[in-house]
């Protein structure tokens, strides 16, 4: 469940048999690209001794063994040193391919693969590149959300990648929206979330060599039916001096489509309250918006009259949410004793 | 503090049922993987069940598929065991564990409750 | 039969070190983290060891995990008498289905 897509750069392959002497045969004008272990940092490699520079045709780079065209005069030992504590993390001895007749049995050369692009690798099983990233294997998502599951691998030859849903392979013909497969990030998406998509995910990740899987446990949270909740703090006390414009704004979450009214409570006959204990209140704006959306009521050019008490009341299906504030508004000539006053000054809604 | 405390266990024949339950208290069940684990006398951990925190999704050990139905209440912060068709090596100890949300693994349990099947 | 193998017992005795090995596949302990259970006698089961070498707050120093390709192990440095107990591994396991597996467990004793 990430928010991005990284860019991730081409994976390299790593010599298979860690710490032990491995041979490769590489044939003239090939490119090399070889990688010490599964980590970038922290690792030199090394030919005959001298540690390579990290730019030019023989180079090494980001744990990484880079020769752009194979050369004769690249044949020869390489190490991978682990900076440090300079541990021998590879071993390498690479051939001209027309050298392999100088190579004796018992040192079993390993097979080498090209890919369409020349660069040649030893064969590899599928292997996870960063298994870090598979640790939530959990996952409880709101109904309604994007969930992106991860299995980033690599292999030689490239391994595939299929999922499944309980078991069954899964190409999303059947969900709503369907899925995303993004096999260059090696990526399952599946967009608006709803109860039938709990279940268990599995990737698979085969080559000719071997494979790998991966689970993870999706469960999606339905949405429990609520009145709508009003953000704390909204509208706010303000401070207006007479002839300003103000805002008051209302804040409102409701999966339900909301109902919005401002309320202005006024007196009647000396009172504020009517006999059945409401509020006597004028309705000022009715409006409808979508979900999370912020509700503004503007009061233009305000006097005296304006000062009093506003309601936000919000309503939907389920029931009703209100949230009260209060206006002040000073005459213009006690400006200079507003904006003095901390308190009152963070309040002030100037709008000319 | 984080608590889970079993109950229902007890003496059942084969064939019969039991409900077992699971009182979870300090802290918010309601978003939390839960599990059933079970230890038969003398014996090492066996997995049974997970449930999601929805309640919704719901996964079993093979040994225990068809017959056992995990199930959760979250206005009652409880989680269940329904176990039906009991056999003589469902006797166990069984526990209650909730899950770590971001590793996936048990990060408390419960005292646990005995359940023997017996003729 | 566990799907995770451990041996059966350990022993050492006091302020020696003792390792306890878990064995599994590419399905379990392979593609998923390591979880360590300590059960001391007549208790339940306590979190050990979490993500292959993760403590949780509590768990003394002296205990450590590690993780290399398809086993695990436990290493208890400095024993003590009340480390007597059941250990046991754990992982989740992605075969046909996805399920939790635990090893069989186990018995150290202290000796002394």
């Known amino acids: 469940l990430e928010a991005s897509e990284e860019m991730e750069q081409e994976p390299c392959l790593a010599p298979i048999l860690e710490q032990q002497e491995q041979v490769l045969t590489v044939a003239l004008g090939q490119p090399v690209r070889l990688c010490c272990g599964r980590t970038e940092r922290g690792r030199h490699w090394y030919k005959e001794g001298s540690r390579l520079a990290s730019a030019g045709r023989v180079r090494g780079w980001r744990g990484r063994l880079e020769i752009a065209s194979f050369l004769p005069e690249d044949a020869g030992r390489y190490l991978c040193l682990a900076r440090g504590s300079m541990t021998v993390v590879h071993n390498l001895t690479l051939l001209m391919d027309d050298s392999l007749t100088s190579i004796s049995n018992d040192e079993d050369p390993k097979t080498l693969s090209s890919s369409s692009s020349g660069h040649v690798y030893p064969q590899q099983a599928p292997y996870w590149t960063h298994p870090q990233r598979m640790e939530k294997k959990l996952h409880a998502v709101p109904a309604g959300n994007t969930v992106k599951f991860r299995c980033p691998a690599a292999g030689n030859p490239m391994p595939t990648i299929h999922w499944l849903k309980d078991g069954q392979a899964f190409h999303g013909e059947n969900r709503i929206g369907g899925i995303r497969l993004r096999h260059q990030h090696w990526s399952l998406v599946m967009e608006s979330v709803v109860p039938s998509d709990r279940g268990t995910y599995t990737c698979l990740v085969e080559n000719s060599l071997g494979s790998i899987r991966y689970s993870y446990l999706l469960d999606v949270l339905e949405r429990s039916p609520h009145r709508p909740i009003l953000q704390a703090g909204l509208p706010a006390n303000t401070t207006a001096v007479v002839g300003s414009d103000v805002e008051l704004l209302c804040k409102v979450y409701s999966d339900a489509q909301p109902h919005i009214q401002w309320l202005k409570h006024v007196v009647i006959n000396g009172s504020s309250f009517g006999a059945d204990g409401f509020p006597y209140v004028q309705v000022l704006k009715t409006t409808d918006i979508n979900s999370s959306e912020v509700e503004v009521l503007y009061l233009r050019n305000v006097s005296a009259e304006d000062a009093g008490e506003y309601t936000c009341l919000a309503g939907n299906s389920i029931g009703l949410s209100y949230q009260s504030a209060w206006l002040t508004v000073l005459p213009e000539e006690d400006l200079t004793w507003t904006t003095a006053t901390p308190e009152a000054a963070s309040h002030h809604h100037h709008h000319h | 503090e984080v608590q889970l405390l079993e109950s229902g266990g007890g003496l059942v024949q084969p064939g019969g049922s039991l409900r077992l339950s699971c009182a979870a208290s300090?802290?918010?069940?309601?978003?939390?993987?839960m599990a059933w684990v079970r230890q038969a006398p003398g014996k090492g951990l066996e997995w049974v069940s997970v449930i999601g925190p929805s309640g919704g999704m719901t996964v079993y050990a093979d040994s225990v598929k068809g017959r056992f139905t995990i199930s959760r209440d979250n206005s009652k912060n409880t989680l269940y065991l329904q176990m039906n068709s009991l056999r003589a090596e469902d006797t166990a100890v069984y526990y209650c564990?909730?899950?770590?949300?971001?590793?996936?693994?048990?990060?408390?349990w419960g005292q646990g409750t005995l359940v023997t099947v017996s003729s | 039969q566990s799907v995770l193998t451990q041996p059966p017992s350990a022993s050492g005795t006091p302020g020696q070190g003792v390792t306890i090995s878990c064995s599994g596949s590419?399905?379990?302990?392979?593609?998923?983290?390591v979880n360590w259970y300590q059960q001391l006698p007549g208790a339940a089961p306590k979190l050990l060891i979490y993500s292959n070498n993760l403590r949780p707050s509590g768990v003394p120093a002296r205990f450590s995990g590690s993780k290399s390709g398809t086993s695990a192990s436990l290493a208890i440095s400095g024993l003590r008498s009340e480390d007597e107990a059941d250990y046991y591994c754990a992982a989740w396991d992605d075969g046909l289905d996805a399920y939790v597996v635990f090893g069989g467990g186990t018995k150290l004793t202290v000796l002394g």
């Open positions: 300090g802290f918010t069940f309601s978003t939390y993987w």
């Open positions: 590419s399905s379990n302990i392979g593609s998923n983290s």
């Open positions: 564990a909730r899950i770590n949300s971001g590793s996936s693994h048990f990060d408390y």
